[in-house]
């Protein structure tokens, strides 16, 4: 089941997602210029079996003044290895959910491709929030947002991250004004909610990150 | 000359339901994804509703899923959005909009959206 909506936005903050969920597709988009080849995809999806999980489906741009052209999508090795650095790398990142049935990769880059990645998330996706550059994290708790169903609906957890500039001065994390919940109102009045404990994940998390993975541009 | 025109909004009461239409020409729409969007006095635009022209993607806004349905006759080269037990909270502005990729959904997604027509007023009095 697809997410209804995309991830919440939190100031100054971008997210990451470290792998994704079976059934994650990922829109076949290209830069100026250029368009998807004719009857080419227009989404990669991430399937597999108990044992391993990889992206159906290739993207190909063609430039659009020549549509007889296309443009292939097979990686260099050197394109692999240089996404690679893009994973977090820190001893405090959650375990590496790429590693885990179910879960594809970051798919490599394809020619041409648009400067954003545009994924369609499935119920049980987790992103990983980090503050921009030039601003640091105050923490009531995990920076990660997880996509659940409830009642028959999608909503993602709020992530318990403010990013702040660094010469504004600011209150303790605990003196901070709770952050509206998705629907605009706090989860304590959302009564058929479901709560559930993710893995915890240390505060100083979003400090430490590898900063790479937040600074590509595919977010 | 790229046209998407809106067609069928208007006053209704809450509970009601309106369907509103959007003629494209200039364009097919059999290779464009067509989406809606809405954008409510005062505040920002806000997505609600995407369909890609293959029918692999079809994205709803949390807040109208289950309630709205959007469709499209490619044939007539025409998209629509069929709004059932509308509330007041869903009065606003609704726009048409296409792209040549595939579906985009959420916030950020305004954009992305190659083409966008001049909107319905739709309104819900409770």
């Known amino acids: 089941e697809l997410c209804d909506d995309d991830p919440p936005e939190i100031p100054h903050a971008t997210f990451k997602a470290m792998a994704y969920k079976e059934g994650t597709m990922l829109n076949c988009e290209c830069k100026r210029g250029f368009r998807r080849i004719k009857s080419g995809s227009l989404y990669m999806l991430c399937t597999g079996n108990s044992s391993h999980s990889s992206w159906d489906n290739q993207c190909q741009c063609t430039s659009s003044a020549t549509r007889n052209t296309t443009k292939q999508v097979t990686p260099q090795p050197e394109e692999q290895k240089e996404r690679k650095t893009t994973e977090m790398q820190s001893p405090m990142q959650p375990v590496d959910q790429a590693s885990l049935p179910g879960h594809c990769r970051e798919p490599p880059p394809w020619e041409n491709e648009a400067t954003e990645r545009i994924y369609h998330f499935v119920v049980g996706q987790m992103v990983y929030y980090q503050c921009v550059q030039g601003y640091r994290a105050l923490h009531r708790g995990p920076a990660e947002s997880v996509c659940k169903m409830t009642h028959g609906k999608t909503r993602w957890t709020q992530p318990q991250l403010i990013c702040t500039g660094e010469m504004e001065t600011s209150q303790f994390p605990g003196e901070e004004k709770p952050q509206a919940s998705p629907e605009g109102r706090p989860e304590s009045e959302t009564s058929c909610l479901v709560t559930t404990t993710d893995f915890q994940i240390q505060t100083e998390m979003a400090a430490t990150m590898e900063t790479s993975i937040f600074t590509t541009e595919y977010q | 000359e790229v046209q998407l025109v809106e067609s069928g909004g208007g006053l209704v009461q809450a509970g009601g339901s309106l369907r509103l239409s959007c003629a494209a020409s200039?364009?097919?729409?059999?290779?464009?994804?067509m989406a809606w969007f809405r954008q409510a006095p005062g505040k920002e635009r806000e997505f609600v509703a995407a369909?890609?022209?293959?029918?692999?993607?079809?994205r709803y806004a949390s807040s109208v899923k289950g309630r709205f349905t959007i469709s499209r006759d490619n044939a007539g080269n025409t998209g629509f959005l069929q709004m059932n037990s509308l509330r007041p909270e869903d009065t606003a502005v609704y726009y048409c909009?296409?792209?040549?990729?595939?579906?985009?959904?959420?916030?950020?997604?305004?954009?992305?959206?190659?083409?966008w027509g001049q909107g319905t007023q739709v309104t819900v009095s409770s």
């Open positions: 200039g364009i097919t729409f059999n290779d464009h994804t």
């Open positions: 909009a296409a792209r040549e990729g595939g579906v985009v959904a959420g916030v950020r997604s305004g954009a992305p959206y190659d083409y």
């Open positions: 369909r890609d022209w293959s029918d692999i993607i079809t």
